[in-house]
């Protein structure tokens, strides 16, 4: 039978999505116990039937990976969790409407920072996602977000930063002092979806100038 309050068994059912990896998470309520089991279903907007997620039926962990099941970028999804306690009490809760394009957050980019004598080069590597194109190959963030660009900053000293930005993958900050340490930060920006990744940071030192030795 249903508990007096579903929140006694189950709370905070939500998608946590990063770079299109979509994980359903939840918490047990105050009356949840370690032997409470959880079963997960999902569906798309306007569909009547919930689909049971294989591998996430009568589980005791509090997360379920729904990346594959929620992989259509233009679709809206829901998931719901049914908790059943050892005593047979049950509660069901569903997520808010989930759009991976809208709700996914961006991880820091993968960047290689290369020291030179009077410059620092930064090479941004394409970010793969679990989303697959029609021919089966994995799409990168750049494939998905056509207005994606990179914002790069080099902290020269406490009061001066140099900035670069664009859609290309290779950047270089010139005119630097040799044998000096700099802090670089690189972020991914997607204006149309108001997305900004956490920064990738690299602390790099320009090479000593050997021309006078």
């Amino acid at each position: 039978h249903a508990p007096e309050d579903p929140s006694d068994l189950l709370q905070h059912v939500k998608f946590q999505s990063s770079n299109f990896e979509n994980i359903l998470t939840w918490d047990s309520g105050p009356e949840g116990t370690p032997d409470t089991v959880y079963s997960i279903e999902y569906k798309t907007y306007g569909e009547r039937d919930w689909v049971a997620k294989k591998g996430c039926q009568r589980i005791t962990r509090k997360s379920c990976n729904l990346t594959v099941e929620t992989g259509n970028l233009t679709e809206l999804y829901y998931a719901r969790v049914t908790a059943v306690s050892a005593g047979g009490r049950s509660a069901t809760k569903m997520t808010d409407r989930f759009s991976s394009l809208q709700h996914t957050t961006l991880k820091p980019p993968d960047v290689t920072c290369i020291s030179k004598v009077r410059s620092i080069q930064m090479i941004v590597h394409p970010t793969p996602t679990p989303i697959r194109a029609g021919d089966g190959h994995r799409l990168t963030l750049e494939d998905i977000f056509h207005d994606l660009f990179y914002h790069l900053e080099l902290q020269v000293n406490r009061t001066y930063q140099m900035h670069l930005g664009g859609k290309q993958r290779e950047y270089e900050f010139f005119g630097l002092t040799p044998d000096t340490e700099f802090l670089g930060t690189i972020m991914i920006c997607v204006p149309t979806w108001a997305k900004e990744s956490a920064p990738y940071m690299c602390r790099v030192k320009t090479l000593p100038d050997r021309t006078w030795t």
């Epitope: 249903a2 579903p6 059912v13 939500k14 798309t44 907007y45 306007g46 009547r48 259509n72 233009t74 679709e75 809206l76 829901y78 719901r80 509660a91 069901t92 809760k93 569903m94 997520t95 808010d96 409407r97």
Partner: antibody, heavy 116, light 113 residues
Framework: EVQLVESGGGLVQPGGSLRLSCAAS????????MNWVRQAPGKGLEWIGE????????TYNQKFEARATLTVDQSKNTAYLQMNSLRAEDTAVYYC?????????WGQGTLVTVSS | DIVMTQSPDSLAVSLGERATINCKSS????????????LAWYQQKPGQPPKLLIY???SRESGVPDRFSGSGSGTDFTLTISSLQAEDVAVYYC?????????FGQGTKVEIK
């Protein structure tokens, strides 16, 4: 069997407020979205808004956003519509209706009459 | 807001004859992810709440007689009652759920001639 039963209608003075209840039975309220729709006498249907009873997340028709508040009490399996600053044109039958897009189950409705 | 316009406002049809109700939306209701149209049809009898007949423009709700069918795509939709029965006397509404706010047509009253 899924059932939705509205209550709380009646005569309200202009400028007053109402709080309507929608008691769900036959399913857990938190397993689906709940909507409110109204129908003025002899008129068509007008969507007021929706709530996800699991999270409390609401979406309102902009026309009602300033005056309507949707809430739920999960422990009572009941959804609520509060409407303020009522005027004569708010006289209508108010329905709660289940689902997230179209509406598969409706309550029988409760009549609200705004008059002095 | 998407405006839904039904025609005609009322319709008188002989028992056993076909009744056709049209619904036009002010913008396309084609939902790209499933290539279906976000349109529903309801039947409302006096003193009763609306009853869902059709969703996704052409999917019949469980328990609804097969004389009711929905068709159309984009902005133009039709509800057809292939052989009108006495119990079909009612007001019929279309509703879009493509975008907020959800909106209904003004209704079409079906009577027996």
């Amino acid at each position: 069997e899924v059932q939705l039963v509205e209550s709380g209608g009646g005569l309200v003075q202009p400028g007053g407020s109402l709080r309507l209840s929608c008691a769900a039975s036959g399913y857990s309220l938190t397993a689906d979205y709940m909507n409110w729709v109204r129908q003025a006498p002899g008129k068509g249907l007008e969507w007021i808004g929706e709530i996800n009873p699991s999270t409390g997340t609401t979406t309102y028709n902009q026309k009602f956003e300033a005056r309507a508040t949707l809430t739920v009490d999960q422990s009572k399996n009941t959804a609520y519509l509060q409407m303020n600053s009522l005027r004569a044109e708010d006289t209508a039958v108010y329905y709660c209706a289940r689902f997230d897009a179209y509406f598969d189950y409706w309550g029988q409705g409760t009549l609200v009459t705004v008059s002095s | 807001d998407i405006v839904m316009t039904q025609s005609p406002d009322s319709l008188a049809v002989s028992l056993g004859e076909r009744a056709t109700i049209n619904c036009k939306s002010s913008q396309s209701l084609l939902y790209s992810s499933n290539q279906k149209n976000s349109l529903a049809w309801y039947q409302q009898k006096p003193g009763q709440p609306p009853k869902l007949l059709i969703y996704w423009a052409s999917s019949r709700e469980s328990g609804v007689p097969d004389r009711f069918s929905g068709s159309g795509s984009g902005t133009d939709f039709t509800l057809t009652i292939s052989s009108l029965q006495a119990e079909d006397v009612a007001v019929y509404y279309c509703q879009q759920y493509f975008s907020y706010p959800f909106t209904f047509g003004q209704g079409t009253k079906v009577e027996i001639k």
